[in-house]
């Protein structure tokens, strides 16, 4: 999906009003020195691409993020504020239902959510002139 035509300000508002708080709750009890961000993004569409990938694509050691509250709210925000996003996700959602597993918060998941927080920070305030 190409995130170029999303309403970035509305997505930012959704993030700041609820998603950010859910991420903080997920990370509660984790030391702020624990994880170094290794995933970065250069502009808002790129940031959303990386956010979508880390939030919804299962990775080795962390298969369950898509069922978390912050993930569901992220999905809702993208569906509302990114034209045509919902249609591209139907097949992906069906595939996810087939491999649904119980929620387990692993250290790998905590690291991944720390990366997500970093990506959202860059989405909210990209360093490039074109904001």
């Amino acid at each position: 999906y190409d995130f170029t035509n999303c309403d970035f300000e509305k997505i930012k508002a959704a993030y700041l009003s609820t998603i950010s708080k859910d991420l903080i709750t997920y990370m509660s009890g984790t030391k702020s020195t624990e994880f170094n961000n290794t995933v970065s993004c250069s502009n808002r569409p790129h940031c959303l691409t990386e956010i979508q990938s880390l939030t919804f694509n299962p990775t080795a050691g962390c298969a369950s993020l898509a069922k978390e509250m912050f993930a569901m709210k992220t999905k809702a925000a993208l569906a509302i504020w990114c034209p045509g996003y919902s249609e591209t996700q139907i097949n992906a959602t069906q595939a996810m239902k087939k491999r649904r597993k119980r929620k387990v918060t692993t250290n790998k998941c905590l690291e991944q959510v720390s990366q997500l927080q970093g990506l959202w920070r860059r989405f909210n305030r990209p360093l490039l002139k074109q904001q």
């Epitope: 903080i24 702020s32 994880f35 959202w120 920070r121 904001q131």
Partner: antibody, heavy 119, light 107 residues
Framework: EVQLVQSGAEVKKPGSSVKVSCKAS????????IEWVRQAPGQGLEWIGV????????NYNENFKGRATLTADKSTSTAYMELSSLRSEDTAVYYC????????????WGQGTTVTVSS | DIVMTQTPLSLSVTPGQPASISCKAS??????VTWYLQKPGQSPQLLIY???NHYTGVPDRFSGSGSGTDFTLKISRVEAEDVGVYYC?????????FGQGTKLEIK
Amino acid sequence: EVQLVQSGAEVKKPGSSVKVSCKASGYAFSNYLIEWVRQAPGQGLEWIGVIDPGNGDTNYNENFKGRATLTADKSTSTAYMELSSLRSEDTAVYYCAREDNTGTAFDYWGQGTTVTVSS
Amino acid sequence: DIVMTQTPLSLSVTPGQPASISCKASQSVSSDVTWYLQKPGQSPQLLIYYVSNHYTGVPDRFSGSGSGTDFTLKISRVEAEDVGVYYCQQHHRFPLTFGQGTKLEIK
């Protein structure tokens, strides 16, 4: 506990350079932007620029472009602001600050470094 | 550059009374406005981010509102510890810019 500790006061001659350091602790240094802001005596706040310590990306206020250089050393968790071609109007308190967890504000500030430019 | 204009530049308030500071942007900054307080002899400290969100530990008597070009910081009941200079800041466009500051004194 997050802390930003800045270097001590400096007295400089016009035309010279100054390098102010900002040592961070209590968080993953490379994960958060470091901002630089200055405040002339009795005046308001003026943004100088920002650096991403993770990759070295910077953005400067045009008013300081060519004179200000922001760098970061991940090995020591220290950010630096160097200002060259100093003039008397550069006399100010220089602050470093860290972006907050959402990327929309500065949540921790250094104690400030007084730079006096005088002949 | 986006110019942030604060009014009034100073105000003197009786403890327990309300106070209000206005901040106007020269062009729309969406909701990308932050409020800081600089107490005498100290570094600035974060109060409100993204127009109306309280930073951790900031008392409920502080509130922010507005969008686009007009923003307001309100203190419902001023206390002695609230003295200092209040700054609004926009982070919608580079360069980031601050208002000129509003000095709050206690009567």
